[in-house]
Interface confidence: low
């Protein structure tokens, strides 16, 4: 009984698209599949950022497959062909794997790349950026800042960039159609006269960074002797009343001090009689049914009685 | 690890030109400035100015702007600073010391020279 | 110029002692969110050596015990327990600006 062989996949190779970290891995049949026709046969797929401890494994029947990378940091793929049982009469037959990897070749110290990068989606409708210059790097240093995600032809430069002494450290992007729910890709790269700059790559989903505007027209209404009803409204904007967790802060009289995260636009306080003055504040986040995380808003503009009877008062802001 | 090593003690003459040199080791060369520092005895330190290894692009202190000249040799990975027309306040400790531009700090410095400006 | 005044010029203190070293410049040495402002140790006879740059951010190897405060004019050194290799004199440095300037020194003497 011979024992039956298979070669490894042919010309494996990853591939930069130009994505800021959205790469293809791609192979080739193995040599000498002909005895094999009426087989299906299938790869097993490995590979990882250098430096993480686990590998994401995909076992698929094409010659090729596409995520997304950390380019700041190399990457590692191993792949090896699989003869299902069906082909062999036995056992499932593996090839040897074939290996390769792909890195950016990085420029310049890391210190010369940008700090503190920070990225909000404003109300789900205006992204904007923000970043300090490295550490160390001269004034005459200037960075630009490109972005791709799944629909977009090609990266594309920020056109709307927010300057401090004629340096960009931050960009206003423009409307960003179908950009949700999907990974989002930025490289923030640099000039200088003087010194190489080291790229930076950012990869996160504009829904878990929305930072939502604040509740507005808060208002009291007196459900029964020793309950009041607070009530706000969501703000306007693109966000579904069903995306919002709020949180509420009361005070009572000036020394009780309520916190409460509800998930609708009401809340019902127990109180005294002898409560003189209620003053309360809600801010929105977007919640865990419509993204992984997210940014609170500011406070609302405080709300506050004050006076004998609360039943005859509705106060609008 | 990172070293600077600078050239030896000189004694000269008012009038003179001293040139003092710093040799590099341990890092890339060409991503760093190099920093010319003295210090008169028993004084403090005084900032001469910086040669860019990557570029060659200098930055002098006015005070010395029209004395000083520093240059860089990239296939030996030294520096060196000249210092004219000395005088006997010249008398100092000599440093040069590795910088990554403006916020990174002096990070790594030679042992020093002594020059001293004597008739 | 940027000037950076040091005080106190010199202190006299005991091992375990907190040890506080202040410097003004005359401008600000702030910029993009930086401060500019580096501090140096220097022993006699030796070279200085870095402690902390940015204002804050700590020399590569240098003990936790040091560290950096401040943003605009106004910078601290804390040694937050003094040990027996800490008496030096300490110097402020602002790299703002060419000239970069030094402040003129705290020797920081045994009690």
């Known amino acids: 009984d011979t024992e039956i062989k298979v070669n490894p996949p042919q010309d494996f190779e990853i591939v930069d698209p130009g994505y800021l970290g959205y790469l293809y891995l791609q192979w080739q049949p193995p040599l000498s599949l002909d005895h094999f026709k009426e087989c299906t046969v299938e790869y097993e797929l490995k590979y990882r950022n250098i430096g993480s401890e686990t590998w994401k494994t995909i076992i698929t029947k094409n010659l090729h497959y596409k995520d997304g990378f950390d380019l700041n940091k190399g990457i590692e793929a191993k792949i090896h062909t699989l003869l299902p049982w069906q082909c062999t009469n036995g056992s499932e037959v593996q090839s040897s794997w074939a290996e390769t990897t792909y890195w950016i070749s990085p420029q310049g110290i890391p210190e010369t790349k940008v700090q503190d990068m920070d990225c909000v989606y404003y109300n789900w409708q205006y992204l904007l950026c923000s970043w300090k210059p490295g550490i160390g790097v001269l004034l005459d240093t200037n960075y630009n800042l490109f972005y791709w995600y799944e629909g977009l032809d090609h990266a594309l430069q920020c056109v709307d960039y927010i300057k401090a002494d004629g340096q960009n450290i931050g960009c206003r992007f423009p409307y960003l159609e179908a950009s949700d729910y999907k990974d989002f890709y930025i490289c923030v790269n640099g000039s200088s006269e003087n010194k190489p700059i080291r790229s930076s790559y950012f990869t996160f989903q504009l829904q878990n960074i929305v930072k939502p505007l604040p509740p507005v027209y808060l208002t009291f209404t007196r459900e029964s002797s020793c309950e009041i009803k607070l009530k706000w409204s969501i703000p306007l904007g693109p966000i579904p009343a069903r995306c919002f967790d709020y949180e509420i802060e009361i005070r009572e009289d000036d020394t009780t001090l309520v916190t409460a995260t509800v998930e609708n636009e009401t809340y019902t306080l127990k109180t005294t009689n002898e409560t003189r003055q209620l003053c309360f504040v809600v801010r929105s986040k977007v919640n865990i049914y419509c993204s992984d995380d997210g940014i609170w808003s500011e406070w609302s503009d405080k709300q506050c009685w004050e006076g004998e009877d609360l039943s005859k008062k509705t106060l609008l802001r | 690890q990172v070293q600077l090593v600078q050239s030896g003690a000189e004694v000269k003459k008012p009038g003179a030109s001293v040139k003092v040199s710093c040799k590099a080791s341990?890092?890339?060369?060409?991503?760093?400035?190099m920093n010319w520092v003295r210090q008169a005895p028993g004084q403090g330190l005084e900032w001469m100015g910086r040669?860019?290894?990557?570029?060659?692009?200098?930055h002098y202190n006015q005070k010395f702007k029209d004395r000083v000249t520093m240059t860089r040799d990239t296939s030996t990975s030294t520096v060196y600073m000249e210092l004219s027309s000395l005088r006997s306040e010249d008398t100092a400790v000599y440093y040069c010391?590795?910088?990554?531009?403006?916020?990174?700090?002096?990070?790594?410095w030679g042992q020093g020279t002594l020059v001293t400006v004597s008739s | 110029d940027i000037q950076l005044t040091q005080s106190p010029s010199s202190l006299s203190a005991s091992v375990g002692d907190r040890v506080t070293i202040t410097c003004r410049a005359s401008?600000?040495?702030?910029?993009?969110?930086?401060?500019?402002m580096n501090w140096f140790q220097q022993k006699p006879g030796k070279a200085p050596k870095l402690l902390i740059y940015?204002?804050?951010r700590q020399g590569s190897g240098d003990p936790a015990r040091f560290s950096g405060s401040g943003s605009g004019t106004d910078f601290t050194l804390t040694i937050s327990s003094l040990q027996p290799e800490d008496f030096a004199t300490y110097f402020c440095?602002?790299?703002?600006?060419?000239?970069?300037?030094f402040g003129g020194g705290t020797k920081v003497e045994i009690k």
């Open positions: 040669i860019d290894a990557y570029a060659g692009e200098t």
């Open positions: 010391a590795r910088g990554y531009g403006d916020a990174y700090g002096m990070d790594h």
């Open positions: 940015a204002a804050s």
């Open positions: 401008e600000s040495v702030d910029n993009y969110g930086i401060s500019f």
């Open positions: 440095q602002q790299s703002k600006e060419v000239p970069w300037t």
């Open positions: 341990g890092y890339t060369f060409t991503n760093y400035w």
